[in-house]
């Protein structure tokens, strides 16, 4: 059962797995919901009636039967994870804490000019985990406006006490704004030699990089293989750390594979999600449950409905015993990931899905894709919105793209004349326009929000949010597109596509149903050459064939330009201007994404 | 009331050495910021070094600086004094606020002191 309102001068009595000092209660439970056993926590605020030494304490809490007995204590706060809800979750934290001082280890420490300057160093730096801004009221000259930058080994601080004219708060590259580089490559017959700051068992290297994303001290990771030659280090993934940030050595070893923390680029790479099953493969560990089950899809599902449950193990059944039922192990331990792996048993292993709502709900997959053709299927961009406007008649106006449950991301450009809000319908999961009719539900837009450095399209900022009336429920024909990671600016986009509902040439109409056209990415220096009279900057992007004939045209506008890198869709573009449609040597331009993503953040997490 | 007793003072030769140390009781736990004051008779108390128990900062009025050292860990503070002078004869007291300040009347809770005299 979720509960997401906290109990006020209420305890929960036993069931410690360990305590932690976070600044607020509110950030006690996400705390609790990261961890990989708790399900309930006590805070305690500062309180004259109250130990000092329990100030700021955040105790994280087990219970078998999900719930423990309730005492009153004044100053005590108390709640549940959100592991038990439904809802989409985050670690990103933006709030600043006024006259608190957190602890941690100070490796750096430099002037800034305001604590929002402190934070964003925080959140460019590997290693840091929160900060302490001294601000120009301190009373100690000599540290007026130091920034420190801390880290600890669980990433929250390791005690947090009353400090006038100090503020303190958190790195944001859990909220996507950190432009430290993602290096997304898993590197082959390849070892780290750095300190380990952590080892666990995984199936693979993928899950151990996921762990490693995860874990706050983790830089980059080594993984042996299962046939790897030493049989006691087969399936272990080592997190590792350095001083520099990047590995000092790397050994050519057969069958070990490396690769990096993805840490600033993890709203758009599935993180908690370990969807695989694992053959032949038996999870070892702490038992919570043996159920009978038909096959290991539904296995997971009961792992998945167990709110303890981490991982499981499913033995098919003998021939023809217990009515065709397999065994189902349930199963949890103290970090979340099996105590010891085994290969050749015949089991089929994997992971509870309970925590993918702790992933962004854009890195879920989709359908396959439809290969060849011009006309899209449904469910195939199930991001892609069409805008209507209802004035002076109900007619298709642009493209737009679900980036949240209540924003949609369009072009400005769109807008020209555009009195109101109240004009403008938004209908998600269609395909063709003639399924729109006086009936069909739609979302009203509350609010239009245009960049405000707009001026036209060919001059850039070309960019605008619609806050939607109501939010959107996701479903296979209605969710979100990842937005592109200020970490991934380096990445080489190779399977892009445009659509969008627009003319199919020049001087034609709106298309029925709705269009796909794969294009390649252009440099920003070629494209240049193809618009001597414009200035293409680094804040558009252009795509299009050399020789012209796929490209988005009117109608389009607002739309999106999606990439598909490391089986996640990206919004690279928004279809923005052109010269003609599919002309020979001139590209279609895009805002680029990338470069917005602090102001798509800025408006959309504006309280 | 908040406890925080100060000991290791005592009577040393010019150019020596002497380590105070501070224990407190949770309330120090929670204060960001303790000092060292002195006292000598019939002047002002004034401060000797500050710091920040969480983050660190550290201040020293001029006359010790390069001479005297603050420190901590856990809930205690320390104050390691070289190259004593007779100048630094006074009562040692320890403190515990939320201000990082020189001034005496930012911090909340106080220790009795202990004696330091130095002789030339």
């Known amino acids: 059962e979720c509960v997401t309102q906290l109990l006020k001068d209420t305890c929960f009595e036993g069931g410690d797995i360990t305590t932690v000092f976070t600044p607020s209660a509110k950030y006690c439970q996400v705390v609790c919901t990261y961890h990989p056993r708790c399900l309930l926590f006590t805070f305690t605020a500062e309180s004259p009636s109250e130990d000092p030494t329990r100030w700021f304490t955040c105790v994280l809490k087990d219970s078998v039967t999900e719930t423990l007995p309730r005492v009153n204590r004044t100053a005590a706060i108390s709640g549940y994870s959100f592991k038990q809800c439904s809802h989409q979750i985050s670690a990103c934290n933006k709030d600043i804490y006024v006259d608190l001082d957190m602890k941690g280890i100070n490796y750096n420490s430099s002037v800034a000019k305001s604590a929002q300057e402190c934070q964003e160093r925080c959140t460019d730096d590997v290693h840091c985990h929160f900060f302490t801004y001294a601000t120009r009221q301190f009373p100690s000259l000599e540290h007026r406006n130091i920034c420190l930058l801390k880290h600890t080994q669980t990433g929250t601080p390791t005690r947090i006490t009353k400090l006038d004219k100090v503020v303190s708060g958190f790195s944001l590259k859990s909220c996507a704004l950190s432009n430290l580089a993602c290096i997304r490559d898993i590197f082959p017959n390849t070892v780290f030699a750095d300190s380990n700051i952590d080892s666990v068992m995984a199936p693979d290297a993928f899950v151990c990089g996921r762990i490693c994303t995860h874990h706050p001290g983790c830089l980059f990771f080594t993984f042996f293989s299962q046939e790897w030659p030493k049989e006691s280090q087969r399936n272990l993934c080592l997190l590792k750390t350095s001083e520099s940030g990047l590995p000092s050595t790397r050994i050519k070893k057969s069958k070990a594979l490396s690769g990096f923390s993805l840490q600033s680029c993890r709203h758009s790479i599935p993180v908690f999600c370990h969807s695989s099953f694992y053959h032949d493969t038996d999870f070892l560990g702490e038992e919570l449950d043996i159920v009978a089950a038909k096959s290991h899809e539904a296995c997971q599902k009961l792992c998945t409905n167990a709110v303890r449950c981490q991982f499981f193990t499913y033995t098919p059944a003998q021939a023809s015993c217990n009515e065709g039922k397999g065994k189902c192990y349930l199963k949890l331990s103290s970090n979340g990931s099996p105590t010891k792996i085994l290969h050749g048993r015949g089991g089929i292993s994997g992971y509870t899905l309970r925590l993918c709502k702790m992933d962004n709900e854009c890195t879920t997959k989709i359908k396959p894709r439809i290969v060849g053709g011009t006309a899209s299927v449904r469910g195939e961009w199930p991001w892609q919105v069409t805008l209507h406007t209802t004035s002076p008649t109900q007619r298709h106006l642009c493209g737009g793209s679900i980036i949240g449950n209540q924003w949609i991301l369009t072009a400005a450009h769109c807008f020209y004349g555009v009195e109101s809000p109240k004009i403008l319908r938004v209908y998600s999961g269609i395909l063709n326009q003639s399924e729109i009719k006086e009936d069909t539900s739609f979302f009203g837009v509350q609010e239009i929000i245009i960049h405000d450095q707009y001026k036209m399209a060919e001059s850039g900022y070309d960019i605008a949010l619609l806050k939607l009336e109501t939010t959107v429920n996701y479903t296979d024909s209605q969710r979100p597109i990842c937005l592109p990671s200020k970490g991934d600016r380096n990445v080489i986009y190779t399977d892009c596509w445009v659509t969008g509902w627009g003319y199919r040439k020049l001087r034609d109409k709106i298309q029925n149903t709705l269009q796909k056209a794969k294009i390649p990415l252009v440099t920003n220096e070629e494209c240049q050459k193809r618009y001597r009279g414009h200035k293409i900057t680094h804040k558009m992007i252009c795509a299009g064939y050399r020789e012209g004939g796929k490209d988005a045209c009117k109608g389009d506008s607002g739309g999106p330009l999606s990439c598909k890198h490391n089986e996640v869709w990206h919004l690279v573009g928004i279809t923005s201007w052109g010269e003609g449609c599919a002309q020979r040597e001139r590209p279609g331009v895009y805002t680029n994404v990338v470069e917005y993503v602090d102001w798509i953040l800025e408006k959309t997490q504006a309280v | 009331q908040v406890q925080l007793q100060e000991s290791g003072g005592g009577s040393v030769q010019a150019g020596g050495s002497l380590r105070l140390s501070c224990a407190g009781d949770?309330?120090?736990?929670?204060?960001?910021?303790m000092a060292w004051f002195r006292q000598a008779p019939g002047k002002e108390r004034e401060g000797v070094a500050l710091?920040?128990?969480?983050?660190?900062f550290i201040s020293y009025t001029d006359s010790v600086k390069g001479r005297f050292t603050i420190s901590q860990d856990d809930a205690k503070i320390y104050l390691q004094m070289n190259s004593l002078k007779p100048e630094d004869t006074a009562m040692y007291y320890c403190?515990?606020?939320?201000?990082?300040?020189?001034?005496?009347?930012?911090?909340?809770?106080w220790g009795q002191g202990t004696q330091v005299t130095v002789s030339s």
């Open positions: 710091i920040a128990t969480s983050s660190g």
């Open positions: 949770g309330y120090t736990y929670s204060m960001g910021a």
């Open positions: 403190a515990a606020g939320t201000q990082f300040s020189w001034s005496p009347g930012s911090y909340n809770y």
